[in-house]
């Protein structure tokens, strides 16, 4: 048995007569043979669940659920209750109604076995019938909403009449009906005004019924019509077995370049028309087990369960359902030498499902793990300016498919054939497993005999020590020009275009800083700034070369303070700035300020 509502409301007036009917509570059956019996909690409660007094005023008919006044609630009784309400004005009291024998002790009042009945207290006598407005004659102030469990026997769940009004104003004629489309499973009996279900409901067909209750009251020779929403929610039970959408029970996957722990290798989706068990219980009650196979597979893979609520269309309305994604995930990094093919089976069990049929599914994953070979092109040819500054990025080396790699740790090294011309360095980028070539020794670069640099690039997989090699030929171009005196170490210091472009700075491939003109649109990613190379700085990312020295690109790498209009980068640098941003790496400070339009003109005039 269960209540069709978790709360009821009615009004109480001073000196209302004993015997006045107040309202009906309704219970619905879970099984056809059940017979409801209602029991009132012993106490009246007030604000913040304060227990006020033993209930001596209101009784219930155990078989019908009718609550009525056993004795009149006079001023002194109300004063008595008010005193115990922790100093708050007592406007509302409530009672607990239990369904026997569900709850035998008065504890927490939880639906479905308990409902609260709230009484709004009015410190006046019941108003004259003629003064009652149609709204007051028709419906309680608080709109009811109803809960009906699916697949349960039909039954009465509401009675429209306001009993105190009917009792005290018998000459007022009130009629009710439900506005609903054809074929809906509800009926309002014209004589008793009881609302009942015509048949058992199916939540998977319809979950919410937004009905409208219509009340018609005589007003002279006219009728006033009052309409209120009458929402019914159908509560779910686990009556649907899990299924495969479109019958897909097998997923095939190839593990090749993505070999990192936690990589999702394949996903299979399971659909369940139910939304129970609820999210808190779901993972415990909806289990997935990777069936024992070989030990290697058990150690290498795990299954992750990702349930998600979705909505599906049923009979023109949307109802909630659950999709369960079962992801086959790498439990560890896989070596590039691994080479296997296997079939994995996962048992999914909806343990709450009662049938008919089984709540169990078998998921199949066909997995091929392919080995990865390291290949480099036979030769790389690059050029570098003699004016390039230290940490200038001049190119990239990359084993075949390196951009696609994850979980593969490749290290790059350079072996110089001419010991005195060892100008370049290489660092491995964590992002795409490439090697970034940069100027490491500017002195060697300026030597006239170092016009052509020959290197061997060696790529090594750290786990297996497998290697790949390539020739690297670097042509040194241009002639060296000494920098003007007083130029800062970092391009980022310069605040104006002219001073920016006449100096060089760490990381500059041409020996000159570059000015990036912003778009001037408030706090923007495209702020104006001075950079060693606009290709790499700023780009919102502090790369592996830029980490070598804070002077290269503080716009991307600074961890210090940024003054002025800006949005900080994650985890460092300037994500967006206002106007022009310049930085003082030694002081660990950047400034973003409005652009000074007159500056270039002044610079020209002052020359």
């Amino acid at each position: 048995l269960y209540f069709s509502r978790d709360a009821y409301w009615e009004k109480l007036y001073v000196d209302q007569a004993a015997g006045t009917p107040l309202l009906y509570v309704h219970a619905l059956r879970d099984a056809p043979e059940e017979v409801p019996s209602f029991r009132l909690g012993q106490h009246l409660y007030g604000t913040y669940r304060t227990r006020l007094h033993e209930n001596n005023w209101i009784c219930i008919q155990e078989d019908t659920g009718l609550l009525y006044l056993n004795r009149s609630l006079d001023h002194s009784s109300w004063e008595k209750l008010s005193v115990r309400n922790r100093g708050f004005p007592l406007l509302t009291v409530y009672l607990k109604v239990f369904l026997s024998p569900t709850s035998l002790r008065e504890g927490e009042c939880q639906w479905p076995g308990c409902a609260r009945v709230y009484f709004s207290f009015f410190n006046t006598s019941f108003p004259a019938c003629s003064s009652l407005k149609p709204r007051e004659l028709c419906f309680p102030e608080t709109r009811p909403s109803f809960r009906i469990r699916e697949n349960r026997p039909p039954g009465t769940f509401h009675q429209f009449r306001l009993l105190p009004v009917q009792f005290l104003c018998p000459n007022i004629s009130v009629a009710y009906r439900l506005l609903e489309g054809e074929g809906l499973p509800f009926r309002c009996a014209p004589d008793s005004l009881e609302v009942s279900t015509r048949w058992a409901l199916d939540r998977e067909q319809r979950e919410k019924y937004e009905l409208v209750a219509v009340c018609t009251v005589h007003a002279g020779a006219r009728e006033e019509v009052v309409m209120v929403p009458f929402p019914v929610t159908v509560y779910d039970e686990d009556d649907s077995a899990p299924t495969f959408p479109a019958g897909v029970d097998t997923a095939s996957a190839v593990v090749e370049f993505k070999r990192k722990e936690d990589t999702v290798v394949a996903t299979l989706r399971v659909f369940d028309a139910d939304v129970v068990p609820a999210s808190g219980e779901l993972v415990r009650r909806y289990t997935s087990t990777l069936l024992p196979g070989d030990t290697w597979a058990q150690q290498t893979f795990r299954v992750e369960h990702w349930p998600n609520e979705t909505s599906v269309q049923a009979n023109g309305s949307f109802v909630r359902a659950t999709v369960h994604d079962y992801r086959l995930v790498l439990n560890r990094n896989l070596s590039i030498s691994e080479n296997r093919t296997m079939q994995l089976a996962v048992l999914v069990n909806d343990s709450d499902f009662q049938g008919p049929g089984a709540g169990v599914l078998l998921l199949h994953f066909n997995v091929s793990v392919l080995p990865v070979s390291l290949h480099l092109p036979s030769t790389y040819s690059l050029s570098v300016s003699r004016r390039a500054r230290r940490f200038a990025q001049i190119g990239k080396v990359c084993v075949e498919n390196c951009q696609a790699f994850s979980g593969i740790n490749v290290q790059y090294k350079l072996h110089s054939s001419g010991a005195n011309c060892s100008t370049l360095g290489v660092v491995t980028s964590a992002e795409d497993t490439s090697g970034i070539l940069f100027v490491n020794d500017t002195k060697a670069l300026r030597r006239p005999k170092c016009a052509e640099l020959h290197y061997m690039v060696v790529a090594t997989d750290q786990q297996t020590s497998r290697q790949a090699q390539a020739q690297l030929l670097v042509t040194v171009e241009g002639s060296y020009v000494a920098e003007e005196a007083g130029c800062p170490l970092s391009c980022a210091v310069s605040k104006r275009r002219l001073e920016c472009e006449e100096c060089g700075g760490l990381g500059s491939p041409t020996g000159r800083c570059e000015w990036r003109q912003g778009d001037g649109k408030g706090i923007t990613r495209n702020f104006s700034t001075c950079s060693p190379s606009t290709k790499t700085c700023p780009d919102g990312h502090c790369d592996v070369v830029e980490t070598q020295d804070i002077n290269i690109c503080p716009q991307d790498c600074l961890r210090g303070s940024i003054v002025g209009g800006h949005e900080p980068g994650e985890p460092r640098g300037i994500k967006a700035g206002y106007g022009t941003c310049n930085c003082f790496p030694e002081e660990e400070k950047c400034f973003c300020e409005p652009e000074d339009i007159q500056d270039p003109l002044c610079d020209e005039l002052c020359r």
Partner: antibody, heavy 117, light 112 residues
């Protein structure tokens, strides 16, 4: 489309009874009340009585003893019965539907009843 | 019973003129629920009456905005701002606040 249609005998002898039927379509008599109004030739409108959606009735005070209104919801019909007709009961008899609190929004076309020997 | 008295009995007007019809009740027709169920109907020769105004001042759907109703308590007025040929006929006020409801005697709007 809401429609009301009166049908009556046309001619009634003095002291005899009158029975008029109002057949409705486009709405249910369980949801709307129906009124009867008459209009003697060249005169004004006179309210006769009504039947509420619940089936209860109200009548014109002066005619109460001679009037009876009933309905058959399943047949969508409302009936007016009037006893002891006199020549001054000669009139066009209308049925009209109450549109909630907005008044007589829908009327029949009327049926002429002549009381004459 | 509530007696509804309409004046004038006949109202000759020129097309385009304003017309005003008065209706007075023998007692207040404010219902205890606060509403006043005062309506105006127009009956053209050989036709059934048509609803124009309900609850004193609300125009029924399809009624031109040259028709307006006003008043309270016991005194009510129907105004036609610019009379057109199709407005000619007999106008009736009606009170539905008290049972039995009652019609006024009617006002005939005709061409001067």
């Amino acid at each position: 489309d809401v429609q009301l249609q009166e049908s009556g005998p046309g001619l009634v002898a003095p002291s005899q009874s009158l029975s008029i039927t109002c057949t409705v379509s486009g709405f249910s008599l369980s949801r709307y009340s129906v009124h009867w109004v008459r209009q003697p030739p060249g005169k004004g409108l006179e309210w006769l009585g009504m039947i509420w959606l619940g089936g209860s009735t109200d009548y014109n005070s002066a005619l109460k003893s001679r009037l009876s209104i009933s309905k058959d919801i399943s047949k969508s019909q409302v009936f007016l019965k009037m006893n002891s007709l006199q020549t001054d009961d000669t009139a066009m008899y209308y049925c009209a539907r109450n549109l909630d609190s907005r008044g007589f929004a829908h009327w029949g076309q009327g049926t002429l009843v002549t009381v004459s020997a | 019973d509530v007696l509804m008295t309409q004046t004038p009995l006949s109202l000759p007007v020129s097309l385009g003129d304003q017309a005003s019809i008065s209706c007075r009740s023998s007692q207040s027709i404010v219902h205890s629920n606060g509403n006043t169920y005062l309506e105006w109907y127009l009956q053209k020769p050989g036709q059934s009456p048509k609803l124009l105004i309900y609850k004193v001042s609300n125009r029924f759907s399809g009624v031109p905005d040259r028709f307006s109703g006003s008043g309270s308590g016991t005194d009510f007025t129907l105004k036609i701002s610019r009379v057109e040929a199709e407005d000619l006929g007999v106008y009736y006020c009606f009170q539905g606040s008290h049972v039995p409801p009652t019609f006024g005697g009617g006002t005939k709007l005709e061409i001067k």
